[in-house]
């Protein structure tokens, strides 16, 4: 009889007696920026502090009738989903409510900013345990709202936001588009994207993961023991805020980067039917449904990575795309992808002391994406080795020459625009382990890292027959850090990582032109962290069909 | 995720000689004006003036006061609704859109964003 949504996100081994407070004694506090709430509801009484914060616009319409139960509906439900005794994710968590949405569920960017500042002031006046801020609201893209979220996140606060219910790219909305926020889309009991009337959950590269958001039973403000079902990305975000609160109550020192990586790593993969999303967004949207991760004590030492897509570069000839990792993460590799296949490659460069992944459009191209592989590598020392393009007819190669440094990724960038001139680059470990090799007119970049116990190997998979994509996966215990395409005769669209799978995409119009000897190869660099071992390079594996 | 989305950014580097103030004439607006791409969600008349990150507390207040003074000279009354100190330097102001050009030329201003609606999801 446990509600479907709790069963979905809380694995059986985490299900405690119905009313048990979160494990551990750390006082995690969740701040909810929403409508007013009914603090006396039996589901949340004694767990909620209704702050005196109130910054809302006037309700529309001269005949608007303020009915307390309607004014409190949205916020009460979400408070229940986060910390409710029976239908809540983090049953013992204390919650503070700030009213930034009026009785019609409308607020302003300025009111939300003042609310975020109120939280910052509270933090300064009385420092407490870990703070989680739930933002179950969305407006159009706002530079200042995103900036405020960034500033608050840098003080150690974890912000969780609704992706939005507009069946649209979440990057067009704020705070969903803020990189420092954990942005959550909504799925239903069948793990499918939520449809809401003619609209539905937002999607795209600004969504970190999905969580239950359809027919979620929770506290209703109709009465102190009333419950109702509500749907939306607000409910999905509330689930993730609850999960984060539980994670922090067990391990209060987890950082935002660790929380995000663990949420991604332990989520349920590949259950969402991606056909629901627009075709151009499918590759950018994570196929992840949140579940409560085990503690790091149970799963320590894993190398955790995630894929970060840039915004689309746009079609201009010199258009570039930039993908960034979070400050705490290491950029272990950089690749690029273009739907037309017209791209001039990718490289890593330092901007303002941070390494970023760049991709360059080619003449006649419709634009490119830069694809960064961002990882948590404790005590890592990483660097980029670059060899400029060699003279005509010669190949360029670069390897990790520092002692104990291992190759985690390769990038290739062509100086010339003429696609016919170049034989595209290759990653070749047969000649020398841990070496990136490019063909003529390509600059080659090797990402090299030293970290205690870090070891890496190349795994290749080639297909000679017609295929739109070639994939290769890292085996259990290994984490994909780099992904490249080594082309046959056909034009490649690029390569990117999906969880532990390296996907090399091929231009489908060229499928018939390929001869059997010209296999397109997906080359993955797979790494793992062995706490006691020294950094090492493992001889690679490859096979062709 | 950090690039500007479907978002309007307008450069309002308007001539400043009408003011006849040396310090103002010397300061050419490099700040930008931004507003929500969805017209129905905009709240014209309320603006968030965002200052450069290193702006000191006193300078925030001085900038807000300077805007009030200069607006008054032009016969406009503006209302500073809130000053932001703790998350970012800036202030929230209720004023006519006629004053945007003036506000963008104030020292320390990085950009001005028109207020807009957010909605429960």
């Amino acid at each position: 009889s446990i509600p479907w949504n709790l069963e979905r996100i809380i694995p059986a081994w985490h299900q405690t007696e119905e009313d048990r407070s979160p494990d551990g004694s750390s006082q995690v506090e969740v701040y909810l920026l929403d409508t007013s709430i009914q603090g006396a509801h039996r589901e949340i009484e004694g767990r909620v502090t209704i702050t005196d914060f109130n910054s809302v616009p006037e309700e529309d319409g001269t005949r608007f009738h303020r009915q307390a139960s309607k004014c409190d509906s949205h916020g009460t439900h979400l408070a229940g989903v986060v910390s409710g005794r029976d239908a809540g994710v983090a049953k013992g968590t204390s919650l503070h409510s700030l009213r930034v949405l009026n009785c019609q569920g409308k607020g302003t960017v300025s009111g939300t900013l003042i609310g975020l500042e109120f939280i910052r002031k509270s933090q300064l006046i009385q420092p407490s345990g870990p703070l989680v801020v739930l933002l179950p609201l969305a407006g159009g893209y706002s530079r200042i709202l995103n900036a405020a979220c960034r500033h608050l996140a840098r003080t150690g606060v974890v912000l969780v936001a609704a992706a939005g219910n507009f069946r649209d790219d979440a990057c067009l909305y704020s705070p969903a588009s803020a990189p420092e926020v954990i942005t959550v889309g909504a799925t239903n009991a069948q793990d499918q994207p939520v449809t809401l009337g003619t609209l539905g959950t937002n999607f795209g590269r600004c969504v970190d993961l999905f969580a239950p958001g359809k027919d979620i039973i929770g506290a209703s403000s109709d009465c102190s023991t009333c419950f109702m079902s509500q749907s939306g990305t607000s409910q999905a975000a509330a689930h993730v805020a609850g999960i984060v609160a539980r994670m922090l109550s067990r391990e209060p020192t987890l950082t935002l980067a660790e929380l995000r990586q663990r949420l991604i790593h332990f989520s349920t993969k590949d259950v969402i039917n991606m056909a629901w999303f627009p075709e151009d967004q499918q590759v950018l949207t994570p196929n992840l449904v949140a579940t409560l991760p085990p503690s790091t004590h149970e799963t320590g030492g894993q190398l955790l990575c995630r894929t970060v897509w840039s915004a689309h570069s746009g079609p201009t000839r010199t258009a570039t795309a930039t993908a960034r990792c979070a400050p705490e993460e290491e950029l272990l590799s950089c690749s690029s992808f273009s739907r037309s296949g017209r791209r001039r490659g990718d490289w890593i460069e330092a901007i303002g002391g941070q390494q970023v992944c760049k991709a360059l459009n080619a003449f006649g191209g419709e634009g490119v994406y830069a694809v960064a592989r961002c990882c948590l590598v404790p005590r890592a020392n990483c660097s980029i080795h670059n060899t400029p393009a060699a003279r005509a007819g010669l190949e360029t190669h670069v390897h990790c020459h520092q002692k104990d440094h291992v190759l985690t990724g390769c990038s290739f960038h062509w100086e010339v625009e003429d696609l016919s001139v170049r034989r595209q680059p290759a990653l070749r470990s047969r000649r020398q382990p841990g070496q990136c090799v490019g063909h003529q007119a390509a600059s080659v970049y090797a990402s090299c890292c030293h970290a205690p116990g870090l070891e890496c190997k190349i795994k290749e998979h080639g297909i000679s027959g017609p295929s739109e994509q070639v994939t290769v996966a890292c085996e259990a215990g290994w984490t994909l850090t780099g992904c490249n395409v080594l082309p046959g005769a056909s034009l490649t669209l690029g390569a990117y990582s999906v969880d532990n799978l390296c996907v090399a995409r091929v231009h489908d119009t060229a499928r018939a032109d390929r001869t059997s000897g010209e296999a397109t190869v997906a080359a993955a660099i797979c790494c793992r962290s062995r706490p006691s071992a020294k950094a090492s390079w493992v001889q690679h594996h490859h096979h062709h069909h | 995720q950090d690039e500007d989305g479907d978002y309007e950014e307008l450069m309002l580097a308007l001539p400043s000689q009408e003011d006849g103030l040396a310090d103002e004439a010397a300061h050419v607006a490099t700040a930008t004006f931004r507003r929500c791409s969805k017209e129905a969600w905009r709240l014209p008349g309320t603006y968030i003036v965002v200052l450069m990150e290193e702006t000191q507390r006193l300078q925030i207040e001085q900038t807000a006061h300077r805007l009030q003074t200069r607006a008054a000279r032009r016969g406009y009354v503006i209302k500073v609704l809130h000053i932001f100190y703790d998350l970012f330097p800036g202030f929230l102001v209720k004023m006519s859109s006629d004053l945007l050009g003036l506000a963008l030329k104030l020292p320390h201003v990085e950009y001005i964003e028109e207020d807009s609606f957010v909605f429960a999801q």
Epitope: D19, S21, H41, R85, D86, A87, S220, T225, C226, F227 | -
Partner: antibody, heavy 118, light 107 residues
Framework: QVQLQQPGAELVKPGASVKLSCKAS????????MHWVKQRPGQGLEWIGE????????NYNEKFKSKATLTVDKSSSTAYMQLSSLTSEDSAVYYC???????????WGQGTSVTVSS | DIVMTQSHKFMSTSVGDRVSITCKAS??????VAWYQQKPGQSPKLLIY???YRYTGVPDRFTGSGSGTDFTFTISSVQAEDLAVYYC?????????FGGGTKLEIK
């Protein structure tokens, strides 16, 4: 597992008082309200009142306000109901029941049969 | 006080039959209604909460529906062990009130 233990029976004289107990185990006693329900032989269920064990807050059915007093002892995880000035009308089975916000009265005691007789 | 009215004090049915018990609230109680089963000599047992949700371990032949003032409890295929009195209860406000009960008799 959750249990609510009640004594089986109490025999009391008219005009006297009786204090019924309900010992809770298998869950955090202070997390959920405790309710008391009366059932006369061959009759339906009648709600008497409820108490919040964490703070002692009570709500009564107006009909029982001068008849019943609800208390708790957190240290022993026990809820009590004192019935005063007993008459034959008070002869009934009295149940304690834990109420969860979502799941209503999900666990009931076995009931204490109170007989008022001289 | 909110009055909960179960129109039938008794209902007679056969094994395998479908039976529905109705309950009417004197005012809107949203979905804050629970249904209980009480077998002879036993304590009441929770079957349905929030008008339509089946409690843990309750067979799926038992269902609940309704909101506002009209509620229905249904047994899709009556079994011999379903002989009992069934009560509706509103949890919308205090005092909590129960319906008078419907005794299900097996022919």
């Amino acid at each position: 597992q959750v249990q609510l233990q009640q004594p089986g029976a109490e025999l009391v004289k008219p005009g006297a008082s009786v204090k019924l107990s309900c010992k809770a185990s298998g869950y955090t006693f202070t997390s959920y309200w405790m309710h008391w329900v009366k059932q006369r032989p061959g009759q339906g269920l009648e709600w008497i009142g409820e108490i919040n064990p964490s703070n002692g807050r009570t709500n009564y059915n107006e009909k029982f306000k001068s008849k019943a007093t609800l208390t708790v002892d957190k240290s022993s995880s026990t809820a009590y109901m004192q019935l005063s000035s007993l008459t034959s009308e008070d002869s009934a089975v009295y149940y304690c029941a834990r109420e969860r916000p979502l799941y209503a009265m999900d666990y009931w005691g076995q009931g204490t049969s109170v007989t008022v007789s001289s | 006080d909110i009055v909960m009215t179960q129109s039938h004090k008794f209902m007679s049915t056969s094994v395998g039959d479908r039976v529905s018990i109705t309950c009417k609230a004197s005012q809107d109680v949203s979905t804050a209604v629970a249904w209980y089963q009480q077998k002879p000599g036993q304590s009441p047992k929770l079957l349905i909460y929030s008008a339509s949700y089946r409690y843990t371990g309750v067979p799926d032949r038992f269902t609940g529906s309704g909101s506002g003032t009209d509620f229905t409890f249904t047994i899709s295929s009556v079994q011999a062990e379903d002989l009992a009195v069934y009560y509706c209860q509103q949890r919308y406000s205090t005092p909590r009130t129960f319906g008078g009960g419907t005794k299900l008799e097996i022919k």
